[in-house]
């Protein structure tokens, strides 16, 4: 799996995933989060090559039609496959409140 | 939605369903398909610019980065959302064969 | 420049429902609380509540709670707010107004022309 | 809940006189070194609009004549060399407790 396990762990150039810490004031203006100040929300990033984590019938078909085709420009994108969720907290008023939001952290991708 | 009917009949620089039409013998090597030569696979293609057709609460996080991040090369991608079946025909020995391949055809992309 | 134009005026029976409609421009709208907030004709200003349209967390005046649902569509920036069981009471004018955004309750810096809402049978 | 007085309910200046109106809440909004406590204008058939943020913070745009100053519980808006067109209802605001609270308004 294109893992944080394995994609952090080595110099992989196809899709895979990777690290990317986002500052939730200074990188997204918001400024009224209190915890954390930042994440570790990570990116997809890689090119997908023929048989490279394929996530459906058609990016397979996709990325047979590039090799044939090598210079088209229909090919399968590194994305995200599984997201994690972060909790936040944040004050209304004086009184503390305790969000999760879902999707937030990418922990492994696919080429779709 | 980013789809065969708004896509097609616009001019739209950002994500969105584009045509392509594989033959199966010239663009895969699929030479044993018996009907249908080829097919429209579609695909997507296109900037995702911040609010344009995001899929989670990541990829809206991603967008809004990339806004504060112009440069950096984190940021969602355009890829397909719903895929349809395609019916083919092949042989085995003598004896055609109707198979149902799915996910083969995009009607719509997304930002992820 | 930061723009919030709201949907006209409406008129309701009794216990009907009226949803209002904030459309923002010239401004990144998952930035950024909105806010709704309601005058009486003749009265002060009285806060309903208010969202992030990030990814829809909202914050709401015990006084509406259960009558009122504010959502967001990120797609076209757009905020809404939808107001239940209508009655006399009800009948005023109806603002979006945008959090300054250091905190999630704020100051509003930017305000919509607000929309007119009369209940009568 | 905090509730906003405003006095007087209603002035009336001359051109280039002083105006000042107060406020006092119900209990202290102030927190973490900041006064949550914010001044509006809305003219005649206009909506609000912001002057003064966090107690004595000029909002950008606003004329230097809107001063707003205070801590704790009373707080004073002044405007200097009062024009026509500061014609209207100025409302108080807190944030410092939920929910959000207006004063009543001095026209």
């Known amino acids: 799996a294109l893992d944080t396990n394995y994609c952090f762990s080595s110099t992989e150039k196809n899709c895979c995933v990777r690290q990317l810490y986002i500052d939730f004031r200074k990188d997204l203006g918001w400024k009224w989060i209190h915890e954390p100040k930042g994440y570790h929300a990570n990116f997809c990033l890689g090119p997908c090559p023929y048989i490279w984590s394929l996530d459906t019938q058609y990016s397979k078909v996709l990325a047979l039609y590039n090799q044939h085709n090598p210079g088209a420009s229909a090919a399968p994108c590194c994305v995200p496959q599984a997201l994690e969720p972060l909790p936040i907290v944040y004050y209304v008023g004086r009184k503390p409140k305790v969000e999760q939001l879902s999707n937030m952290i990418v922990r492994s991708c696919k080429c779709s | 939605a980013l789809d065969t009917n708004y896509c097609f009949s616009s001019t739209e620089k950002n994500c969105c369903v584009r045509q392509l039409y594989i033959d199966f013998r010239k663009d895969l090597g699929w030479k044993w398909i018996h009907e249908p030569k080829g097919y429209h696979a579609n695909f997507c293609l296109g900037p995702c610019p911040y609010i344009w057709s995001l899929d989670t609460q990541y990829s809206k996080v991603l967008a809004l980065y990339n806004q504060h991040n112009p440069g950096a090369s984190a940021a969602p991608c355009c890829v397909p959302q719903a895929l349809e079946p395609l019916p083919i025909v092949y042989y085995v020995g003598r004896k055609p064969k109707v198979e149902q391949l799915s996910n083969m055809i995009v009607r719509s992309c997304k930002c992820s | 420049e930061v723009q919030l134009v709201q949907s006209g005026a409406e008129v309701k029976k009794p216990g009907a429902s009226v949803k209002v409609s904030c459309k923002t421009s010239?401004?990144?709208?998952?930035?950024?609380?909105m806010n709704w907030v309601r005058q009486a004709p003749g009265a002060g200003l009285d806060w309903m509540g208010q969202?992030?349209?990030?990814?829809?967390?909202?914050n709401y005046n015990e006084m509406f709670e259960g009558r009122v649902t504010l959502t967001a569509d990120t797609s076209t920036s757009t905020a809404y707010m939808e107001l239940s069981s209508l009655r006399a009471g009800d009948i005023a004018v109806y603002y979006c107004a945008r959090g300054y955004g250091n905190y999630a309750l704020d100051a509003m810096d930017y305000w919509g022309q607000g929309t007119l809402v009369t209940v009568s049978s | 809940d905090i509730v906003m007085t405003q006095t007087p309910p209603s002035l009336s200046v001359s051109p280039r006189e002083t105006a000042s109106i107060s406020c006092r809440a119900s209990?202290?909004?102030?927190?973490?070194?900041?006064?949550?406590m914010h001044w509006y204008l809305q003219k005649p058939g206009q909506s609000p609009q912001l002057l003064i943020y966090l107690a004595s913070n000029l909002e950008s745009g606003v004329s230097d004549r809107f001063s707003g100053s205070g801590s704790g519980t009373d707080f004073t808006l002044r405007i200097s060399r009062v024009e026509a067109n500061d014609t209207g209802v100025y409302y108080c605001?807190?944030?410092?407790?939920?929910?959000?609270?207006f004063g009543q308004g001095t026209k």
């Open positions: 605001q807190q944030n410092d407790e939920d929910p959000l609270s």
């Open positions: 209990e202290s909004v102030d927190s973490y070194g900041n006064s949550f």
């Open positions: 969202i992030f349209p990030a990814w829809g967390s909202t």
């Open positions: 010239g401004y990144t709208f998952m930035t950024y609380w």
